[in-house]
């Protein structure tokens, strides 16, 4: 089943997806599409990278992380209710049927009328930070050391189960990655 992410109307949504390039500058093509991952490629492509660049994107869809270090997490700017649905992150590893496919479910909630409390109780804001080492500048992607042989889907599921913000903070500085090569 898809991992679920939430954002409010008017906010930016964040859908995490990572891999570890085999060598610096030796990238794997990645596509993001609206709709569940099909057998090949991505349906309704919104963004694509090739062996070295972002070579296709559509309005409001962008990579805010360092994609050349494997952070291919998708940011959707200024979301509306129509952005709800399944998104596919496909890491196009060379070879037959080698692709890593991740279906991520985005749920858009109507904007709150009342101001948000100062303490962030909604896990949505904490979870994205768990999966990236990016701050305001570039940083190396790290592999999660305390949980061996864990993949992105497992981390995503785990994160959704760990609603406690203290645990979220404990994991925040680790990056869940897929190793290529």
């Amino acid at each position: 089943s898809e991992v679920e992410y939430r954002a409010e109307v008017g906010q930016n949504a964040y859908l995490p997806c990572f891999y570890t390039p085999a060598a610096p500058g030796n990238l794997v093509p990645v596509c993001w599409g609206k709709g569940a991952c099909p057998v090949f490629e991505c349906g309704n492509v919104v963004l694509r990278t090739d062996e070295r660049d972002v070579n296709y994107w559509t309005s409001r869809y962008w990579l805010n992380g360092d994609f050349r270090k494997g952070d291919v997490s998708l940011t959707i700017e200024n979301v509306t209710l129509a952005d709800s649905g399944i998104y596919c992150c496909r890491i196009q590893i060379p070879g037959i049927m080698n692709d890593e496919k991740f279906n991520l479910k985005l749920v858009i909630k109507p904007a709150k009328v009342t101001p948000a409390p100062t303490r962030q109780r909604d896990f949505t804001a904490a979870f994205p930070r768990m999966l990236t080492t990016r701050g305001h500048g570039p940083a190396e992607t790290q592999t999660l050391g305390s949980l061996p042989d864990i993949n992105l889907t497992q981390i995503s599921t785990l994160a959704n189960e760990l609603r406690d913000s203290r645990l979220a903070n404990d994991l925040r500085d680790s990056g869940a990655t897929i190793r290529i090569g």
Partner: antibody, heavy 119, light 107 residues
């Protein structure tokens, strides 16, 4: 010493094609990408596309899609840029530049080739 | 395409001055921003790559800063040989794009 040496100036008629060469020396040719950038007289720089000198893979700017072809010959460590269906707007200095993918930037440039399109 | 807007388009300063050139990207490009110097009739020369890294052989009076959308090239102690046009360039998304250039003159 790293060097990129380009072919000489060309004068072409509108509708014709031009092929500019870029010969590399002083480094492992297949470890780098070759980009092509042009500069019209008195204007800024315009990126045209890249070729992976190892695999031959290419990526062209949309402005040039269908009109530009980038190739390379690893045996003589040379890259080529062919531009077809020339118009007077294609009058420019054409540069090749090398780029290592790990730090994508153009660290060495050819001396430039002036292509003049005139009837 | 990602637009890069440089400011100012030209400037004039005396030898020894500290000058800064700004480059703003229309979308976030991380640190994939490079700076080039071009003298009249010559090919561009790489000064700074990935926003802050000084290219080998380039004098240390040149420095770069910024991340995301806002970047700056600083020439710390302007010299007569720094008279040139300076371009920023992004290597995040295809097509790669350049700023329109900043012409630096020595007073």
């Amino acid at each position: 010493e790293v060097q990129l040496v380009q072919s000489g100036a060309e004068v072409k008629k509108p509708g014709a094609s031009v092929k500019v060469s870029c010969k590399a020396s002083g480094y492992t040719f297949t470890d780098y990408y070759i980009h092509w950038v042009r500069q019209a007289p008195g204007q800024g720089l315009e990126w045209m596309g890249w070729i992976n000198a190892n695999s031959g893979a290419t990526n062209y700017a949309q402005n040039f899609q269908g009109r530009v072809t980038m190739t390379r010959d690893t045996s003589i460590r040379s890259a080529y840029m062919e531009l077809s269906n020339l118009t007077s707007d294609d009058t420019a200095v054409y540069y090749c530049a090398r780029d290592r993918a790990t730090t994508p930037s153009f660290d060495y440039w050819g001396q430039g080739t002036l292509v003049t399109v005139s009837s | 395409a990602i637009q890069l807007t440089q400011s100012p388009s030209s400037l004039s300063a005396p030898v020894g001055d500290r000058v800064t050139i700004a480059c703003r990207a229309s979308q976030t490009i991380g640190h994939y921003l490079n700076w080039y110097q071009q003298k009249s009739g010559k090919a561009p020369k790489l000064l700074i790559y990935t926003a802050t890294s000084l290219q080998s052989g380039v004098p240390s009076r040149f420095s770069g800063s910024g991340y995301g959308t806002d970047f700056t090239l600083t020439i710390g102690n302007l010299q007569p040989e720094d008279s040139a046009t300076y371009y920023c360039q992004q290597s995040f998304g295809i097509p790669y794009t350049f700023g329109q250039g900043t012409k630096v003159d020595i007073k």
